[in-house]
C-alpha cells in the first residue's frame, strides 16, 4: 500500500517502527488500552472483569472504576465487609458479622472499632448505692458504701446482719448448700 512511518499511521500515541520485511512497511506498537494494526481500537478493559465480587466496571479512559455490590469495598471490590476472616480484633475481641458490616465485640476493658482502645470499665458507673469503682486488670471491683454488699453493691445489708439476697433458685431452700 506504500504507507510508511512518515505518514503517521499509528493512532492513539502508538509508536511506529519500520517493517523488517517488504510485506509490512511499518509496525505500530500500541500504548496500554489500545490495539489493532494501527492502534485504532480501544481495548475493552472491562471485558476482563477486573472488578471482584460482581462489581460494576467503568472504563474512564485514563483508569478503571469499580462500583461495588452491597457488602463489598475496595478499589476492585476485593474486601468483603461481612467477612470476619479479614478482620483482626485486638486484645481478645471477637468479630461479629452481619448488617453489611462486621464489628468487634471487645473484651472487658477494651473498646473502639478494633478493640485497640483501652476502655474505662468504671465509666458506666456500675457500682450501685454510692459504691466506689476501681478498674482492675480482670475487670472492675466495687468497694461498697456502708450498708450494701454484692459484686455491684446491689444488695442492702439489714440491721440484724442478714442481707436481702435474691430468692433461692427453684428446688433450693434458703440455707441449703448449692450443688
Amino acid at each position: 500500500s506504500g504507507v510508511t512511518c512518515a505518514d503517521g499511521p499509528c493512532f492513539n500515541g502508538g509508536l511506529c517502527v519500520g517493517g523488517a520485511d517488504p510485506d509490512s512497511a511499518y509496525i505500530c506498537h500500541c500504548p496500554p488500552g489500545f490495539q489493532g494494526s494501527n492502534c485504532e481500537k480501544r481495548v475493552d478493559r472491562c471485558s476482563l472483569q477486573p472488578c471482584r465480587n460482581g462489581g460494576l466496571c467503568l472504563d474512564l479512559g485514563h483508569a478503571l472504576r469499580c462500583r461495588c455490590r452491597a457488602g463489598f469495598a475496595g478499589p476492585r471490590c476485593e474486601h468483603d465487609l461481612d467477612d470476619c476472616a479479614g478482620r483482626a480484633c485486638a486484645n481478645g475481641g471477637t468479630c461479629v458479622e452481619g448488617g453489611g458490616a462486621h464489628r468487634c465485640s471487645c473484651a472487658l476493658g477494651f473498646g473502639g472499632r478494633d478493640c485497640r482502645e483501652r476502655a474505662d470499665p468504671c465509666a458506666a458507673r456500675p457500682c450501685a448505692h454510692g459504691g466506689r469503682c476501681y478498674a482492675h486488670f480482670s475487670g472492675l471491683v466495687c468497694a461498697c458504701a456502708p450498708g450494701y454488699m454484692g459484686a455491684r453493691c446491689e444488695f442492702p445489708v439489714h440491721p440484724d446482719g442478714a442481707s436481702a439476697l435474691p430468692a433461692a433458685p427453684p428446688g433450693l431452700r434458703p440455707g441449703d448448700p448449692q450443688r
Epitope: 481495548v43 478493559r45 477486573p50 460494576l56 483508569a63 472504576r65 462500583r67 478499589p75 476492585r76
Partner: antibody, heavy 128, light 112 residues
Framework: QEQLVESGGGLVQPGASLTLTCKAS????????MCWVRQAPGKGPEWIAC???????AYSASWAKGRFTVSKTSSTAVTLQVTGLTAADTATYFC??????????????????????WGPGTLVTVSS | DIVMTQTPASVEAAVGGTVTIKCQAS??????LAWYQQKPGQPPKLLMH???VLTSGVPSRFSGSGYGTEFTLTISDLECADAATYYC??????????????FGGGTEVVVK
C-alpha cells in the same frame, strides 16, 4: 508527613486571570490524581478539575471547561489557571488528592472516587 | 451530572446523643459514597468511603450505611468536638464519557 499547600490567591479585579499552585510533599505523586475544589463563603465544596499524574490526563466539571485549566508543572506541583474571573468565582480554592490504586497484572489503575488529603486552601476574592 | 441531596440542613443534639444525616443520590451509585467533616477555617476531612469504611483514626462512634441511592451517616455518643458541617460526596461517569465528582449541600451539626 503528607501535605498539600496552595498558593497564588488574593484580591483580583473582575475579568483578570489567575494561576494557583499546589505543592505536594511527603508522598509519591504517582498513582494519584491532584484535584481542585472550591468553596464559596457559606456554601458547600464544588469540584473543578483533576489531573491524573501517571499520564497527565485531565478532566474537569462541565461548567469549568474553557475557563479553568489544570496542569502538572513538576513532579510535585500542579497549577490551576483561571481566566475571566467574576465575583461568582470568589471562594477558597483547595487542592485535594484522589488516590488511584495499581495491582500487579491488572489492566489499569483503579480510581478511588474520593479525596483523602486536602490542603488548607487559598482565598481568591474577585472585586473591583 | 449526578446530584447529591443532604438532609437535614442543620441538626442540634446534646452531648452523648445521636445524630443521623441522610444523603440521597439522583442515580444508583452502588456504594460509591464518601463522608467529610469540615470545621470553620479548615479543609474538609475524609471520615468514610465506600459508604461504610471508616478512615484510619476516625472514632467508631461514626458509622455509615446505605446502598444505591440512599445513604446515612450516624454519629453516636456525641462529643463537643463533633460540632461541624458534614458533606457527602460521590463520583460519576456519564454516558458521554465525562468523569467527575459531586458534593452534597452539607449538614451543620450543633452540639448542646
Amino acid at each position: 508527613q503528607e501535605q498539600l499547600v496552595e498558593s497564588g490567591g488574593g484580591l483580583v479585579q473582575p475579568g483578570a486571570s489567575l494561576t494557583l499552585t499546589c505543592k505536594a510533599s511527603g508522598f509519591d505523586f504517582t498513582s494519584n490524581a491532584m484535584c481542585w475544589v472550591r468553596q464559596a463563603p457559606g456554601k458547600g465544596p464544588e469540584w473543578i478539575a483533576c489531573i491524573y499524574n501517571d499520564d497527565g490526563s485531565a478532566y474537569s466539571a462541565s461548567w469549568a471547561k474553557g475557563r479553568f485549566t489544570v496542569s502538572k508543572t513538576s513532579s510535585t506541583a500542579v497549577t490551576l489557571q483561571v481566566t475571566g474571573l467574576t465575583a461568582a468565582d470568589t471562594a477558597t480554592y483547595f487542592c485535594a488528592r484522589s488516590p488511584y490504586y495499581t495491582y500487579g497484572g491488572a489492566p489499569s489503575a483503579y480510581a478511588s472516587g474520593y479525596f483523602n488529603l486536602w490542603g488548607p486552601g487559598t482565598l481568591v476574592t474577585v472585586s473591583s | 451530572d449526578i446530584v447529591m441531596t443532604q438532609t437535614p440542613a442543620s441538626v442540634e443534639a446534646a452531648v452523648g446523643g445521636t445524630v443521623t444525616i441522610k444523603c440521597q443520590a439522583s442515580e444508583n451509585i452502588y456504594n460509591s459514597l464518601a463522608w467529610y467533616q469540615q470545621k470553620p477555617g479548615q479543609p474538609p476531612k475524609l471520615l468514610m468511603h465506600d459508604a461504610s469504611v471508616l478512615t484510619s483514626g476516625v472514632p467508631s462512634r461514626f458509622s455509615g450505611s446505605g446502598y444505591g441511592t440512599e445513604f446515612t451517616l450516624t454519629i453516636s455518643d456525641l462529643e463537643c468536638a463533633d460540632a461541624a458541617t458534614y458533606y457527602c460526596q460521590s463520583d460519576y461517569y456519564s454516558t458521554g464519557g465525562s468523569y467527575g465528582f459531586a458534593f452534597g449541600g452539607g449538614t451543620e451539626v450543633v452540639v448542646k
